[in-house]
Interface confidence: low
């Protein structure tokens, strides 16, 4: 467990008065419909709130929306609906906020049936002013910003046209027709699939994958017989139909689609799917669905090229294409992921990996907790976490697990303690060491959020009744204070704090209901006076991440290196501050077999760190298709895990020879690829 000073819960002094002076109420002059909230930029304090209200009339639906703006983190709001000419904004497109601190915002308006095209309102000054623009098409999707240049936008039209703007939506050009899916890649590249015959649905598996690197002046066909494609990290993936049957396989490219290799993954049939669970520049977690309506599949982890895959986890819960999976990247500690498996008896169990999918284990049972009715042995069981799947099944779970990169080691989640996830009312658990150990933090379901990089945790009870109390903790969830933020309870709808967990402001959203009307209301609480002083050196202590055996010289080594962090002492009540940067000291570890994955043609028997040859490939030359050339592999079965930084120690031999023979893998060889210009 992370360092903490065991002490009786001390009350934060005079907190009621301090918080009362920093609690700001705003009542919105709206009938209660729906409300959506977006932060514009980072550390700007600018929030946009869009409220919409639908009145279903006999012949049509009459809609009304209002736009509000705050520039002080939600303490005060100004009605700016007149800036968008009191137009009804379509909520299904949301508010398209530009990347980084561009200050750009696009709102898509509802237009009457007979109009030639849609209408947008654009702002490039953090929503101080808006420009109305009529579009030459009806948008099907929200405007998508290029990650590299926020002036470049793309959108699909209801008639499957791909439209691009180079001047932040002022002027639009249709660069291609018959487009099913379009995505920005790196360097302002656009990838998209097109159909030749009937429609996206009819041509599924016969689509073409195209690329334009100059916003539609010229195009290159980079794939045929495409079912779908996806981008993850530096990898471009395409699922491609096989020549002879209805199965499809994953192909991967690391050069924007110029050359492709077939991923060493199982092929899937019509009813199955692939899903990229997580990807970075080093590697990919790929889910491959099982045949049949099982609701589970297998997780594979890739090598650094995205080609060779190791089986990581069996019976991984993933309901259907685009369905629910509990796969969660624990962002507060490197290498940690949590997900759910569907066991043989159809119960759902939580698994955790601390080494990027190398090994999975159950979550340790929290101290001082009892095993529930799902446990066969009342003394031996595990913690099971509720995530997306529980929420989709309408369980009493208001929030998914929460972790933040700058709140090192902290993970908060709803869960139950037993042999499997239970449908009974869950409690909230916290880990302060990235998931190695857990303690019950709050009884019953709550909404929760992390402020000031972990210096404060705020929670609100999940209740069907109106609420007026917020709970907060300054010691990573050990002790809690309660604050009554209003005399008149509200029907709570959500907690909002600035993304990134650096803020000290929290907004409580809800509505009040009187005899005749109901209105939106927000309470913004600033905790700056609770954390009165800035943290100093003495407030921090050294913590070794992934430490399980302090006696071992290699303790804390994960993916070839260990990291020591400066962590805030639990007993320190002070501000990390908005400019807080996580301080860490990495040190390289010696290589062991654990730092290598099994190479193509090899596998690891269970509970063994050695890689052995697959029986069916014994004595065969290991040749595979890579970048359209046949390669010959000389290996003793090991390949370094992507992102592993170990040095020295064990060093298995590996060599790849180019056989100078052309090969294709049910896919485009370079000669077949064509280019064209407009």
């Amino acid at each position: 467990s992370a360092p903490g000073e065991d002490e009786e819960c001390g009350r934060v002094r005079d907190f009621v008065a301090k918080l009362a002076n920093n609690t700001h109420q705003h009542v919105f002059d709206d009938l209660r419909g729906s409300v959506s909230l977006s932060w514009v930029g980072d550390s700007t304090g600018v929030i946009l709130v869009l409220t919409t209200f639908h009145v279903p009339l006999v012949i049509m639906t009459f809609g009304q929306s209002k736009l509000y703006r705050s520039e002080d983190y939600g303490k005060n709001f100004k009605d700016i609906t007149d800036l968008i000419n009191n137009t009804f904004i379509r909520t299904e497109f949301g508010m398209a906020i530009g990347p980084e601190n561009s200050g750009k915002v696009v709102l898509t308006a509802e237009v009457s049936g007979g109009s030639r095209g849609g209408r947008i309102f654009r702002s490039s000054d953090f929503a101080k002013n808006f420009v109305q623009t009529d579009l030459p098409f009806h948008p099907l999707t929200q405007m998508m910003y290029s990650p590299q240049n926020s002036d470049y936008l793309l959108a699909l039209s209801t008639e499957n046209g791909l439209w691009v703007s180079k001047n932040f939506g002022g002027k639009w050009e249709e660069i291609h027709k018959a487009v099913c899916l379009a995505k920005w890649g790196s360097d302002n590249t656009i990838f998209f699939t097109t159909y030749a015959n009937g429609s996206c649905k009819a041509d599924l598996g016969a689509l073409e994958l195209w690329r334009t690197s100059d916003l539609g002046k010229s195009f290159k066909t980079i794939g045929v017989k495409i079912y779908s494609f996806g981008l993850g990290g530096r990898f471009l993936f395409a699922s491609v139909m096989a020549d002879k049957d209805t199965t499809r396989r994953i192909h991967v490219s690391t050069d924007q689609g110029d050359t492709w290799s077939m991923a060493q993954l199982p092929s899937v049939g019509q009813e199955q799917f692939y899903s990229i669970l997580a990807a970075n520049d080093d590697m990919v977690f790929m889910h491959v669905d099982e045949p049949g309506d099982t609701g589970f599949g297998t997780i594979f982890t890739s090598d650094d090229r995205g080609i060779v895959y190791s089986k990581s986890l069996d019976r991984h819960l993933y309901t259907t294409t685009g369905g629910e999976t509990d796969f969660t990247n624990v962002t507060s500690l490197r290498g940690v992921y949590i997900t759910s498996v569907l066991s043989e008896d159809n119960s759902i169990q939580t698994m955790i990996t601390f080494d990027q999918g190398g090994r999975w284990t159950h979550l340790r049972k929290p101290e001082n907790s009892e095993c529930d009715a799902t446990a066969k042995n009342k003394n031996e069981c595990s913690l099971h976490i509720h995530a997306s799947y529980s929420i989709s099944q309408k369980l009493n779970v208001p929030m998914a697990p929460l972790s933040e990169p700058n709140a090192v080691g902290i993970v908060i989640a709803h869960g139950s303690v037993g042999d499997a996830i239970s449908v009974m009312v869950p409690d909230v658990y916290i880990s302060d060491d990235g998931g190695y150990s857990w303690t019950k933090m709050l009884e019953g379901p709550h909404y929760y959020t992390i402020l000031d990089s972990g210096g404060i945790i705020v929670a609100i009870e999940h209740s069907s009744r109106p609420i007026n109390v917020i709970k907060f903790s300054t010691d990573e969830g050990q002790c809690w204070q309660t604050y009554t933020f209003t005399r008149d309870p509200i029907y709570f709808t959500g907690l909002a704090s600035e993304p990134g967990a650096r803020s000290m402001n929290i907004s409580i959203w809800g509505f009040t209901e009187s005899f005749l009307t109901s209105q939106w209301v927000s309470y913004t609480i600033d905790f700056k006076d609770i954390l009165e002083r800035n943290c100093e050196e003495k407030d921090y202590t050294i913590w070794l991440a992934h430490s399980t055996d302090p006696e071992d010289y290699e303790d804390g080594c994960i993916l070839g290196y260990k990291e020591q962090f400066l962590r805030l002492r639990k007993s320190s009540v002070c501000q990390n501050g908005r400019d807080y940067v996580v301080t860490k000291q990495p040190s390289i570890c010696l290589c062991s077999l654990e730092d290598f994955l099994c190479d193509f043609g090899y596998y690891r028997p269970e509970n063994d760190s050695k890689c052995v040859e697959q029986p069916e490939l014994k004595g065969h030359d290991l040749e595979f298709c890579l970048y359209g050339r046949e390669e010959h592999l000389t290996t003793n079965g090991y390949r370094k895990i992507p992102g592993d930084k170990c040095q020295g120690g064990v060093n298995p031999v590996r060599e790849v020879k180019d056989l100078k023979k052309k090969c294709t893998s049910n896919f485009l060889s370079p000669e077949k690829q064509n280019s064209k210009s407009n």
Partner: antibody, heavy 124, light 107 residues
Framework: QVQLVQSGAEVKKPGASVKVSCKAS????????MHWVRQAPGQGLEWMGW????????RYAQKFQGRVTMTRDTSISTAYMELSRLRSDDTAVYYC?????????????????WGQGTTVTVSS | DIQMTQSPSSLSASVGDRVTITCRAS??????LNWYQQKPGKAPKLLIY???SLQSGVPSRFSGSGSGTDFTLTISSLQPEDFATYYC?????????FGGGTKVEIK
């Protein structure tokens, strides 16, 4: 639609065995437990046990242990309950019932789909 | 084994009445309790699972409450098709056990 169809009525002599079948359709057979429940004339419901069609695993009520065998044939989506050494007080309607899976969680397995029942009469 | 005791064993009521049936477990069963309706010559039908969750397709006039040892099934406004026998069932611990049943008759 989802349904369970059971085999027809049986008349047996004391000491004999009876095997009742339950054919499932309209859902993934392996994904839900199959329970067996019986009801003697004019009496309440009595749980006998379950079979997990996925793995073939079983759990029987203590009262029937040693006399009951629950099996399944996944190729034809059918569950079976065989009761041996029949006595006259085994005269009852025998039901198969699908355990409500509730998307995978253990939640007390309410039984959400029932067969029409098979009447077993034990008489000399 | 956990004993499930239902009360009353029978009751007479009129269409439109509010009817309450209780079920008591001999030890705590958390919320692992289900309610069924059975009509003569027919198989039981699941009404409520996990103490208070309404099974899909079941009218909203049926509701369940309780946890631990005491549970209640309520029919807010009795309809002609509701005259039947009602059973509670626990499934916290094996063996699963049913209550003795409550017969709801026309007054």
């Amino acid at each position: 639609q989802v349904q369970l169809v059971q085999s027809g009525a049986e008349v047996k002599k004391p000491g004999a065995s009876v095997k009742v079948s339950c054919k499932a359709s309209g859902y993934t057979f392996g994904a839900y437990y199959m329970h067996w429940v019986r009801q003697a004339p004019g009496q309440g419901l009595e749980w006998m046990g379950w079979v997990n069609p996925n793995s073939g695993g079983t759990r029987y009520a203590q009262k029937f242990q040693g006399r009951v065998t629950m099996t399944r044939d996944t190729s034809i989506s059918t569950a079976y309950m065989e009761l041996s050494r029949l006595r006259s007080d085994d005269t009852a309607v025998y039901y198969c019932a699908r355990g409500k899976r509730s998307s995978g969680w253990y939640e007390g397995y309410g039984m959400d789909v029932w067969g029409q029942g098979t009447t077993v009469t034990v008489s000399s | 084994d956990i004993q499930m005791t239902q009360s009353p064993s029978s009751l007479s009521a009129s269409v439109g009445d509010r009817v309450t049936i209780t079920c008591r477990a001999s030890q705590s069963i958390s919320s692992y309790l289900n309610w069924y309706q059975q009509k003569p010559g027919k198989a039981p039908k699941l009404l409520i699972y996990a103490a208070s969750s309404l099974q899909s397709g079941v009218p909203s006039r049926f509701s369940g409450s309780g946890s631990g040892t005491d549970f209640t099934l309520t029919i807010s406004s009795l309809q002609p098709e509701d005259f039947a026998t009602y059973y509670c069932q626990q499934s916290d611990v094996s063996p699963i056990t049913f209550g003795g049943g409550t017969k709801v008759e026309i007054k």
